[in-house]
């Protein structure tokens, strides 16, 4: 006998997690067999929709992989033409384990500003968000708060806020942790100890101290009368985010010395400055007819270059001539660290013999200058490129220190060995040998101003030089 459809198993509320299977059952008794249709939120579910599976003549509806958007009211309607259609409805509640959709990222922030670490979450039930700093739960206070969105806001960031953070999203279905991120607190550079001003005698040594701090640790640069310090020795040490810089100066003129501490914050820099003046008591420029005395060389820098027990001229215009001249050489040699292997030994020989000139003892001790030919050999053969660069820097005012100018002879002003062989000094390391003429390296492209000997490259301790003309 025909029988109107009766739903024997009404639809129930189904809870399902995202990506899980969800099944509604609508068991129907009727004769003949009914047509069963399904709706979601009153919209018909198409039987060919591959996201759904229908079994047992439509009595079982399965969502094969639940999505967030599947949430809603599902109804089955059974109709077999006998009596009216019957309907049963049930809800699908899409539950979702917590998911962090916008995790926190590493942040660098300047002390005193506001930091926000994002942590946006999804989940059903709505997850609660907490934060962990290091290994401990983070406590909220007047500066630190977890926003409704889950993000962490820190007002007036302090150094102690730096560290590792992660957010935790929790609901009844589970817990999600973000990756660990770093909050780095940067601090503007500031000077803790400024250099002190000094009034000293000409030729004195002065050490200027400058101490600075910041995060990251700042770098310290020294400025002399508005230009980068080109002479003097700088010693630096860093401890516990504090940098200590000491500038040792050989004073030949007054000046304003500025310590500049700089650190970088992203694309921007922060700087702090402190200045000190160096004045010279009864200062006047050193005269050309400086007096001095002969003494054996007792320094270290020119040991390998000057003849053993060589008598050198020590200039008494310096308070401590030996130390002052040694510092001049030392400073000049530091600049030679970057020159070519061909140039360096020749330049070292020239510098040492120029600053510690050979001394002619007598009633009036007299310095013997280097012969012009040797100076030109260094300038235009061994160190042609380097000399051009150095002269260019001098003209551009990059070498303001008189110490530097003192360390480089002007070849054209030196006496020639042709005028009076005893009036000028030869460089002992440039030993002339006519047989080596064919072994010289090619001359530089710049044409020499005078005939100069072609000198082959050699080790730092010995040169063989073949003249293009007689030097005897």
């Amino acid at each position: 006998l025909p029988k109107a459809p009766v739903i024997t198993t009404p639809l129930e509320t189904v809870d399902a997690l995202v990506e899980e299977v969800a099944t509604f059952m609508c068991a129907v008794e009727s004769y003949p067999q009914p047509e069963i249709s399904w709706t979601r939120n009153k919209i018909l579910i198409k039987l060919f929709d591959t996201r759904y599976s229908i079994r047992e003549n439509g009595q079982l509806l399965t969502i094969l992989s639940v999505e967030d958007s599947d949430d809603g009211i599902y109804c089955c309607t059974a109709n077999n033409g006998v009596g009216g259609a019957v309907e049963s409805c049930g809800a699908l509640q899409v539950k979702m384990k917590p998911k962090i959709t916008r995790p926190p990222i590493n942040v660098k922030i300047i002390e005193g500003l506001k930091a926000v670490l994002p942590c946006t979450t999804m989940g059903n039930p709505k997850p609660s968000v907490s934060w962990i700093k290091g290994d401990s739960p983070l406590r909220e206070n007047s500066r630190i708060a977890v926003l409704e969105s889950g993000s962490l806001r820190i007002h007036n960031v302090q150094k102690e806020d730096a560290g590792q953070y992660r957010c935790v999203a929790k609901n009844s279905l589970g817990t999600a942790y973000s990756k660990v991120v770093k909050l780095e607190v940067e601090v503007f550079a500031r000077i803790l100890r400024a250099p002190e001003s000094h009034n000293v005698t000409f030729g004195s040594f002065v050490t200027l101290h400058c101490t600075a701090t910041g995060i990251p640790v700042p770098t310290i640069t020294w400025i002399e009368n508005g230009n980068a310090v080109s002479s003097g020795s700088i010693q630096e040490s860093v401890k516990d985010r504090v940098i200590d810089s000491r500038l040792q100066l050989f004073i030949t003129k007054p000046g304003l010395y500025t310590c500049i501490a700089t650190n970088k914050h992203g694309e921007k820099f922060s700087t702090a400055k402190a200045a000190a003046t160096i004045s010279i008591a009864e200062w006047s420029k050193p005269q050309k007819d400086n007096k001095g005395y002969c003494a054996q060389y007792r320094g270290e820098v020119c040991n390998a270059v000057l003849a053993k027990d060589a008598l050198v001229f020590l200039n008494t215009s310096y308070a401590d001539p030996e130390e002052a001249q040694e510092l001049l050489v030392h400073t000049a040699w530091n600049e030679l660290k970057v020159v070519s292997p061909v140039c360096r030994p020749a330049a070292e020989a020239l510098l040492c013999n120029h600053i510690f000139q050979e001394c002619s003892p007598g009633v009036v001790p007299t310095p013997i200058p280097i012969c012009r030919e040797y100076c030109l050999a260094v300038k235009e053969l061994f160190c042609a490129k380097e000399w051009l660069v150095m002269e260019e820097k001098t003209h551009r005012g990059l070498y303001r220190s008189e110490m530097h100018l003192l360390s480089v002879p002007e070849c054209s002003k030196l006496p020639s060995m042709h005028w009076d062989p005893t009036a000028c000094a030869r460089l002992p390391h440039l030993d002339y040998n006519k047989e080596n003429l064919k072994t010289f390296p090619p001359m530089t492209s710049s044409k020499p101003s005078v005939d100069i000997p072609n000198l082959p490259s050699s080790s730092s301790s010995s040169f063989s030089v073949s003249p293009t003309y007689s030097m005897t």
Partner: antibody, heavy 121, light 107 residues
């Protein structure tokens, strides 16, 4: 009395084909979902395929999809499983089972005795 | 696919004992779980369907319980014919799956 009898099993080389049949009696065949379940020697049960009472809703396990085809002939009260591209791991006893809708899902209330399929070179 | 995990994989018991076999689904499956018994050389036999309904003709010493993802088959007062392999199965998904089986042996 409900009866399900499988046939068509045997020895086949890898890559070969076989067609299993299941003859049903003792119930209204056209009113029930029918399934194939297999059991490798000494192993557990593995569901293979399912077909709705009218032959409209068909499902396969991932391991056989694309190689096996389930079908039915309600007029002959018969269920079939066409097996192509057979592999050694298809070696098993193949059972046909009747699906029954209950208050919570379906279950297999009647099973055949099984038909052994051996895939070996 | 929904995975069904049975425990233990085997257990020894004596006639008259009460034993329980557990089955855990990889997701909630409502009550769409069935239990089967298989003795050597025979086809499986339905014991329990819809988690707790006893199939007709099955002795009442067999009972099933559970809902969601955790299910249990209990045999109270083991009989010699009960020593067999037991399988759980879910039908919540159209791609139904079985547990790996629990072998019940005589101690």
């Amino acid at each position: 009395e409900v009866q399900l009898v499988e046939s068509g099993g045997g020895l086949v080389k890898p890559g070969g084909s076989l067609r299993l049949s299941c003859a049903a009696s003792g119930f209204t065949f056209s009113s029930y979902t029918m399934d194939w379940v297999r059991q490798a020697p000494g192993k557990g049960l593995e569901w293979v395929s399912s077909i709705g009472s009218n032959g409209d809703y068909i499902y396969y396990a991932d391991s056989v999809r694309g190689r096996f085809t389930i079908s039915r002939d309600n007029a002959k009260n018969s269920l079939y499983l066409q097996m192509n591209s057979l592999r050694p791991d298809d070696t098993a006893d193949y059972y046909c089972a009747r699906g029954q809708l209950a208050v919570a899902g379906t279950h297999f209330d009647y099973w055949g005795r099984g038909s052994l399929v051996t895939v070996s070179s | 696919d929904i995975q069904m995990t049975q425990s233990p994989s085997s257990l020894s018991a004596s006639v008259g004992d009460r034993v329980t076999i557990s089955c855990r689904a990889s997701q909630k499956v409502n009550k769409y779980v069935n239990w089967y018994q298989q003795t050597p050389g025979k086809a499986p036999r339905l014991l329990i369907y819809a988690a707790s309904t006893l199939q007709s003709g099955v002795p009442s010493r067999f009972s099933g319980s559970g809902s969601g993802a955790n299910f249990t088959l209990t045999i109270s007062g083991l009989q010699p014919e009960d020593f067999a392999i037991y399988f759980c199965q879910q039908s919540y998904s159209p791609l139904c799956t079985f547990g790996q089986g629990t072998k019940l042996e005589i101690k």
